[in-house]
């Protein structure tokens, strides 16, 4: 016969009872049955009792009485009674339900979210329920989109159901926000709040937060943590696939972190206790949200026991260069679990030796490499708990680019000058690893005799490699090389000896090794002028004479030669240019600038200076000459001639020293006849001295000298007596 459904003692679809009262509800049926209650009513609660009994005619029916003492507002909901073990296809006839409102004037809403809004996920175009169900069916509820908008139920798009809340049949983005259900009971306003989030299917990121690949010893626990990051309004399903999935080897724990105000973070943690070899392989974490899908995988390696293998990455001897910002010394290591790493340099812990040594994984990083970093490096690898130890040594050679020491210590701002014809020794001392070779080169200077430019020595000229037999440039005496220990380092000193300095140019010593090449240029400028700069005054002139000054400078060291006159006006020294370089005479090694002032007067006295500019420093150099023009003065004799006697055949000197300005011209007369220089009669400097060799009788007579200049003349005379007879008279 057809089974009749269970009957409840309260008729109708709903019933209202007051909070604090006892709810009695009986179920009568033709089979054994059970109660289904609102989630808030715990079957273990002391308030609740369910008593079963046989009832009806002949006790053939099943009765069950539910008693809920001191019913509370949150006990509002569906109470149903259904038969046990009846096919679900006949559900309608096997279950009876009633919705019971537990009315509480102080609590109009069954679930109150006043402080923290309840989050509701919505999908546009779908039904959205704002679940502000009430404890009494006749409570008036208003739905507001906070704070200003009211959503009015229209029976179509917005429907009010006191058992469910507000049903929005076709939700749009306009319903996103803070939705508040408001009810006023006995003059009190009650609110319950909901935050609607648009459900999206965006998966921002998926990661397995374990290093890849994962390595484990057999028997240990594998833990893999998969993290999915999504926007706040996304939910995801996370699944794992792994090698021994069919035997359900793994346990998976899930949790969600919603503490971040911008994103949700979902965690899925896979754990396998006591891993075996069969657990090795690919582990994949799959994340799905609606149509969106992302996955990430990692490999798991299982090892039977701890091990270390270490090999040289390239060769056993390594090379680097001093000055390198960073050098990585690394070995090829395979090990599990990760060993402790210590690097030794020449047997001592490297990182203790210098702060420039850093350990990174299986590498030693040397910062700012210096030649002191050369040596033997040993990597010590140890897995102490398993008593596994390995070490390996590599040799590091630090090559050094050549350095020329004279280049570093040279304090000359401009080139040295080498005297013409001198012997010179040039030296270059070089250091580098490997030991550098040193060669010498010669580059002649460019002689430019055009007036527009000064001579110069540039790098444009062709360079010649020298050897001791070279006949290019200056004659070379020798090129020698020797080793010398300087500052504790084995350095190479190369010496070039120039036998005869004649040609200006540039000598270069070039030190080379496999790291690089360095050169030192030695400007070899020949000078025929002392110190490369010389001023000469022919003689101090007298009024009316010519002033003749010359200035000679080394042509490779100086340019812009000018004569200037220094005059002091109002305590200020003024420079007056009186001659220019274009008047200069360029010779092989020097430039000479002559200055001639004709027919000088006293006003031409003063300080004359030769000015030239140093080609290398740009500095102007002055060499001064004080010139005092003398007044004209009539001649006067310092001593008059006096008579004297001289023996025949001997020699005699007559002096006629006169002063005057300009310097007087001396003329000699004998017996009023002008004396000319002839054999046996010598006129000394300026004709002031008359020297007679092997006096004869004919030399006797009146001698007189006359000193003459523009201002006048002065005379003096004396008689020369020749004593004794000549050979001729003796013969007679």
């Amino acid at each position: 016969s057809k089974l009749k459904g269970p009957e409840l003692s309260l008729k109708g679809t709903q019933h209202v009872t007051q909070a604090g009262q006892t709810l009695h509800l009986q179920c009568r049926g033709e089979a054994a049955h059970q109660w289904s209650l609102p989630e808030t009513v715990s079957k273990e609660s002391k308030r609740l009792s369910i008593t079963k009994s046989a009832c009806g005619r002949n006790g053939k029916q099943f009765c069950s009485t539910l008693t809920l003492n001191a019913a509370q507002a949150n006990h509002t909901g569906f109470y149903s009674c259904k038969y046990l073990a009846v096919p679900t296809s006949k559900k309608k006839e096997t279950e009876s339900a009633i919705y019971i409102f537990i009315s509480d004037t102080g609590r109009p809403f069954v679930e109150m979210y006043s402080e923290i809004p309840e989050i509701i996920h919505m999908t546009e175009g779908r039904e959205l329920i704002i679940p502000c169900r009430v404890t009494s069916p006749n409570i008036t509820v208003t739905l507001k989109k906070f704070p200003l908008d009211t959503l009015i139920p229209d029976g179509k798009r917005v429907i009010w159901d006191s058992r469910k809340g507000f049903i929005i049949s076709n939700a749009t983005y306009k319903e996103i926000g803070l939705l508040t259900c408001e009810a006023t009971v006995n003059g009190h306003l009650y609110k319950t709040n909901y935050l609607t989030h648009r459900q999206t299917n965006t998966i921002i990121d998926v990661q397995i937060s374990t290093p890849r690949p994962v390595k484990l010893l057999r028997g240990h626990t594998l833990i893999l943590n998969c993290t999915a990051t999504t926007p706040l309004n996304t939910r995801v399903q996370m699944t794992w696939s792994y090698p021994d999935e069919k035997n359900k080897r793994a346990s998976v724990r899930r949790r969600i972190d919603q503490s971040n105000s911008h994103a949700n973070i979902f965690y899925s943690v896979l754990t396998i206790d006591k891993v075996q070899n069969k657990d090795k392989g690919l582990y994949t974490c799959r994340v799905r949200s609606g149509p969106s899908f992302k996955s990430v995988n990692t490999s798991v390696h299982i090892y039977d026991k701890a091990f270390i293998t270490v090999k040289h990455r390239k060769q056993q001897v390594l090379e680097t260069v001093a000055g390198k910002r960073s050098y990585r010394l690394s070995m090829k290591v395979k090990a599990f679990p990760s060993p402790e790493v210590v690097w030794l340099k020449d047997g001592l812990p490297a990182t203790e030796k210098s702060a420039r040594y850093l350990t990174r994984g299986y590498s030693l990083i040397i910062k700012d490499v210096t030649e002191e970093d050369a040596g033997n490096y040993t990597i010590l690898l140890s897995i102490k708990q398993s008593n596994v130890f390995k070490n390996l040594t590599a040799t590091l050679i630090v090559n050094v680019k050549p350095q020329i020491y004279e280049k570093a210590v040279s304090s000359f701002p401009d080139p040295a000058l080498y005297p013409l014809g001198s012997r010179q020794i040039l030296t270059c001392t070089a250091y580098g690893i490997p030991r550098p070779t040193i060669k010498w080169c010669w580059r002649p200077c460019n002689h430019n005799h055009s007036e527009a430019r000064y001579d110069f020595c540039s790098n444009n000229e062709e360079s010649f490699i020298l050897d001791p037999d070279s006949n290019i440039g200056n004659r070379i005496e020798s090129i020698t090389q020797r080793m010398a220990i300087i500052e504790g380092k084995n350095k190479t000193a190369s010496t070039l000896v120039v036998a005869d300095s004649r040609i200006s140019g540039i000598y270069s010593c070039i030190a080379s090794n496999k790291v690089g090449t360095v050169g030192r240029n030695i400007s070899f400028y020949i000078t025929d002028v002392p110190n490369g700069f010389h001023v000469n005054l022919e003689k101090m002139p007298t009024e009316g004479e010519d002033l003749k000054l010359s200035c000679t400078v080394n042509k490779f060291l100086y340019r812009d030669v000018t004569w200037i006159l220094l005059r002091t006006v109002n305590n200020r020294t003024m420079h007056y240019s009186i001659s220019k370089q274009k008047m200069a005479i360029t010779k092989e090694h020097s430039i000479t600038l002559n200055l001639t002032i004709m027919n000088v007067s006293l006003e031409d006295s003063g300080t004359y200076a030769c000015r030239a500019r140093n080609v290398y420093t740009g500095e102007e150099i002055l060499q001064k000459k004080e010139v005092t023009i003398r007044d004209q003065e009539a001649p006067y004799l310092l001593r008059n001639l006096s008579d004297h006697t001289v023996a025949i055949s001997s020699s005699t000197t007559l002096d006629c020293h006169a002063n005057g300005a300009p310097e007087p011209q001396i003329t000699w007369f004998k017996n009023n006849h002008k004396i000319q220089q002839e054999p046996g009669i010598i006129l000394g400097p300026g004709s002031s001295t008359l020297f007679i060799e092997r006096v004869t009788e004919e030399d006797e007579g009146v001698y007189h000298c006359k000193a003459t200049n523009q201002k006048g003349s002065v005379e003096s005379s004396a008689y020369l007596t020749v004593q004794g007879t000549s050979d001729k008279s003796n013969l007679e």
Partner: antibody, heavy 119, light 111 residues
Framework: EVQLLESGGGSVQPGGSLRLSCTAS????????MNWVRQAPGKGLDWVSS?????????YHVDSVKGRFTISRDNSKNTLYLQMNSLRAEDTAIYYC???????????WGQGTTVTVSS | QSVLTQPPSASGTPGQRVTISCSGS????????VNWYQQIPGTAPKLLIY???QRPSGVPDRFSGSKSGTSASLAISGLQSDDEADYYC???????????FGGGTKLTVLG
Amino acid sequence: EVQLLESGGGSVQPGGSLRLSCTASGFNFEDYGMNWVRQAPGKGLDWVSSINRNGDISTYHVDSVKGRFTISRDNSKNTLYLQMNSLRAEDTAIYYCTKNHDYHGMDVWGQGTTVTVSS
Amino acid sequence: QSVLTQPPSASGTPGQRVTISCSGSRSNIGNNFVNWYQQIPGTAPKLLIYLNSQRPSGVPDRFSGSKSGTSASLAISGLQSDDEADYYCASWDDSLNGWVFGGGTKLTVLG
């Protein structure tokens, strides 16, 4: 970029009128409630008026301006208005236009327009 | 006189934690959510906290809000010199049918 730009401020004598405008950009204007908030010189913030999304159901005003000020909006022009009549000296302030946040509060503020009422 | 009550001033040294209180009544804070605004002198206010404790994006997590009954508070930890500003609490008021603000608290960062 979400922006609100107020205009229409100025000096007026007591009893006079002014109309403030606020032009919105960078968001869907018709989907948000809007407000006017003022700040008297050296004083705190005071709410003046609010209007709901459509401008057809709800407008709210602080008691001190009721009957004198009217808030309105033109969604087609993305503009919010405040018509101020019978102005008093105590209405002197910077007037800020603000947008309601989806989840409560005023999340966007204009730079303000100054209204000075003095004889 | 403001509907919500705030202390007129607060101060702290850099790195310190400072708390600003805001008290109201059932019709505002008691029944509604609290927002906090920061106003740096000469600029428009900026939303700092909404829904009692939520931070808009871009607001550092040094700022936190809480509510209990008819009172709310704003806490600023690891105080920085650029936190010097006026802070206002606000809530909807069901009786007045409008927004209500606190009188503002001037925060000074010392030293």
